[in-house]
Amino acid sequence: GPVWRKHYITYRINNYTPDMNREDVDYAIRKAFQVWSNVTPLKFSKINTGMADILVVFARGAHGDFHAFDGKGGILAHAFGPGSGIGGDAHFDEDEFWTTHSGGTNLFLTAVHEIGHSLGLGHSSDPKAVMFPTYKYVDINTFRLSADDIRGIQSLYGDPKENQRLPNPDNSEPALCDPNLSFDAVTTVGNKIFFFKDRFFWLKVSERPKTSVNLISSLWPTLPSGIEAAYEIEARNQVFLFKDDKYWLISNLRPEPNYPKSIHSFGFPNFVKKIDAAVFNPRFYRTYFFVDNQYWRYDERRQMMDPGYPKLITKNFQGIGPKIDAVFYSKNKYYYFFQGSNQFEYDFLLQRITKTLKSNSWFGC
C-alpha cells in the first residue's frame, strides 16, 4: 500500500470538539503523532492555515466522504491512507463523547489508531496492538505501542536512526562561509536576493554587505523546508517556490490561498517529479525550468510551454550543466547559475560564462 514519500509531514486540526478544551485536543493529537514519530524517522508539525498533509476533522453523520458516521457508539472514527486531497485525513465522530481519560472515548488512544491508518497501516490481528480494530481503554500514562505496531510502521518508514541518513539531520544552520556551501534555490525578491538551504534562507539586500539568516517557517509558516527552486516575476510582485511536484505562489510576500498546486499545471510531462531550478527573464517574459540535464521554457503571458522543449542544458548554455542546483536573474543581462559550491555569471546576450565564483561570494566570504 501507499506511504508518505517524505519525512516531514504537516497536520491541521480543522475544527474542535466541544467535549474538550481546545488545549486538551491539541495536546492529545500532538501526543498521538509523537507516538509514531518516536519509532520512525517521521517528523510531524501542526499548521493552522493552508493545506496540511493530514487534516483532523470532528464531524457527525454524512460529512463529505462515502462513510457517514453512525451516531454514538459503533464507528468512532476513520482515516484515509497516505495520498493527496483527502488522503491521510482523520475523521472523528462528533456523536461520541471525547475525553482525556477513561470515561467516554479517549481521544488520544483513538487518534493513535487513526494516525496509524493515516501513515499507511492496516488493522492488526494482535489484540495488544493499537491497530487492533476494536477500541479498548488502556492507561494513557503507561501506553506503549506493541511490538506488532512497531514492526508494521518500521516496515514502512524504517527506524528513527534513518534520520541520520538525511542531509543536515539536526537541521542546524549551515555555516555561511563554508567553502563547500551549496544552495537549494536562489531568487531575487525586489531588491533583495533570497538564498534557500534546508529550512533556512539568507537575505541579501543589494549592494549591502550585511545578510541575515531566517527560518523559512518564520516568514511563511505554511511553506515546507527544503525549497528546491524559486523565481520572481517582479512586475507582478510574484514569487514562485517549488518543492517535489508542488509549487506555492507568494504575492507581495504573502502566500496565496489554494496552494500548493501541481507543477504539472505548467505542462510538464508526468515523468517530471521535481524542478531543480527556475528563472524568469523579464526581457522575453519567459521562465526557464531546469530538470536534471534538460530545461523547459514557459511563456508566462500565454501560460503555456513553448514548443520544442525540453532541450539539453549543455547544448544551449555554454559551459553550464549538465545539472544545476539554482539560478537567478540580475542586472538585466546575467543569469547566476549555482552548481554545488560553484557559481557562474552567465551573460545571456553573449551566451557565455563571464565569471566563475564561489556560491557564497555574495556574502563577503
Partner: antibody, heavy 122, light 103 residues
Framework: EVQLLESGGGLVQPGGSLRLSCAAS????????MHWVRQAPGKGLEWVSG????????MYADSVKGRFTISRDNSKNTLYLQMNSLRAEDTAVYYC???????????????WGRGTLVTVSS | DIQMTQSPSSLSASVGDRVTITCRAN??????LNWYQQKPGKAPELLIY???SLQSGVPSRFSGSGSGTDFTLTISSLQPEDFATYYC?????FGQGTKLEIK
C-alpha cells in the same frame, strides 16, 4: 499508463439482466477502490456503486440497491457490475472509475474508462 | 443527506473571458469537493480535487477555491478547448452540471 476498458453493454428488455466488465491495466488494481458511474442520454453523471480494494466493502446508490451487485476479481484485474431487474431508467452509458488507495473511499475519480452503453427497451 | 447545487446550469462566454462556476453543499463538506470536465462523447476528466488542488496535467488557468459549503471553479482565460460541461462532486453526489458554450 492507466487504462480502464468497459464491456458488456447492449440492448436488453425491461426485467432482464446484464453483466458489465471493466478490465484495468497500468496500475496495482488490488490497491484501489473502484466505482461505477452512469450517465443517461443528455443527462448528468450519477454514481452507481463502489467496491473496496479487497472486495470486502461495497456501496450502492439507493436507485440500484437490491438489483445491482458490484464485484471484482483482483487476480484478473477486472471489475464487474451485475445488473438484474433492469428498468428503462437504467438506460445510460456506464463508466468504471478508479478511486484512491486504502481502507476508505474518497470518491476521487482520477481515471475513467470510455464507457459502455446499456439500453433497456422493449 | 448531502445535496450539491451547481450554478449556472449553462453559460455563454468568449475565448479570453474569465469564467466562474459555483457549487454549494447543504452542509459542510470541508474541502472534499472535486471538479470534472466532460466533452461530448467522452468520459469525464478530473480537473481539481480537494477544492483547490490541480490534477496533474491540467493547465494553470483552471483554479478552484472554497471550503465548507461554498466552492468555485474559475477559468482565468477561456481557451477554445475549454468549452465543455463541468461537474462538481463529493463522494456519491454530483452537481447537475454547467454547460459552457461559445457566445
Amino acid at each position: 499508463e492507466v487504462q480502464l476498458l468497459e464491456s458488456g453493454g447492449g440492448l436488453v428488455q425491461p426485467g432482464g439482466s446484464l453483466r458489465l466488465s471493466c478490465a484495468a491495466s497500468g496500475f496495482t488494481f488490488s490497491w484501489y477502490w473502484m466505482h461505477w458511474v452512469r450517465q443517461a442520454p443528455g443527462k448528468g453523471l450519477e454514481w452507481v456503486s463502489g467496491i473496496s480494494p479487497s472486495g470486502g466493502m461495497t456501496m450502492y446508490a439507493d436507485s440500484v440497491k437490491g438489483r445491482f451487485t458490484i464485484s471484482r476479481d483482483n487476480s484478473k484485474n477486472t471489475l464487474y457490475l451485475q445488473m438484474n431487474s433492469l428498468r428503462a431508467e437504467d438506460t445510460a452509458v456506464y463508466y468504471c472509475a478508479r478511486d484512491i488507495v486504502g481502507p476508505y473511499s474518497a470518491g476521487l475519480f482520477d481515471y475513467w474508462g470510455r464507457g459502455t452503453l446499456v439500453t433497456v427497451s422493449s | 443527506d448531502i445535496q450539491m447545487t451547481q450554478s449556472p446550469s449553462s453559460l455563454s462566454a468568449s475565448v479570453g473571458d474569465r469564467v466562474t462556476i459555483t457549487c454549494r453543499a447543504n452542509q459542510s463538506i470541508y474541502t472534499y469537493l472535486n471538479w470534472y470536465q466532460q466533452k461530448p462523447g467522452k468520459a469525464p476528466e478530473l480537473l481539481i480535487y480537494a477544492a483547490s488542488s490541480l490534477q496533474s496535467g491540467v493547465p494553470s488557468r483552471f483554479s478552484g477555491s472554497g471550503s465548507g459549503t461554498d466552492f468555485t471553479l474559475t477559468i482565468s482565460s477561456l481557451q477554445p478547448e475549454d468549452f465543455a460541461t463541468y461537474y462538481c462532486q463529493q463522494a456519491g453526489i454530483f452537481g447537475q452540471g454547467t454547460k459552457l458554450e461559445i457566445k
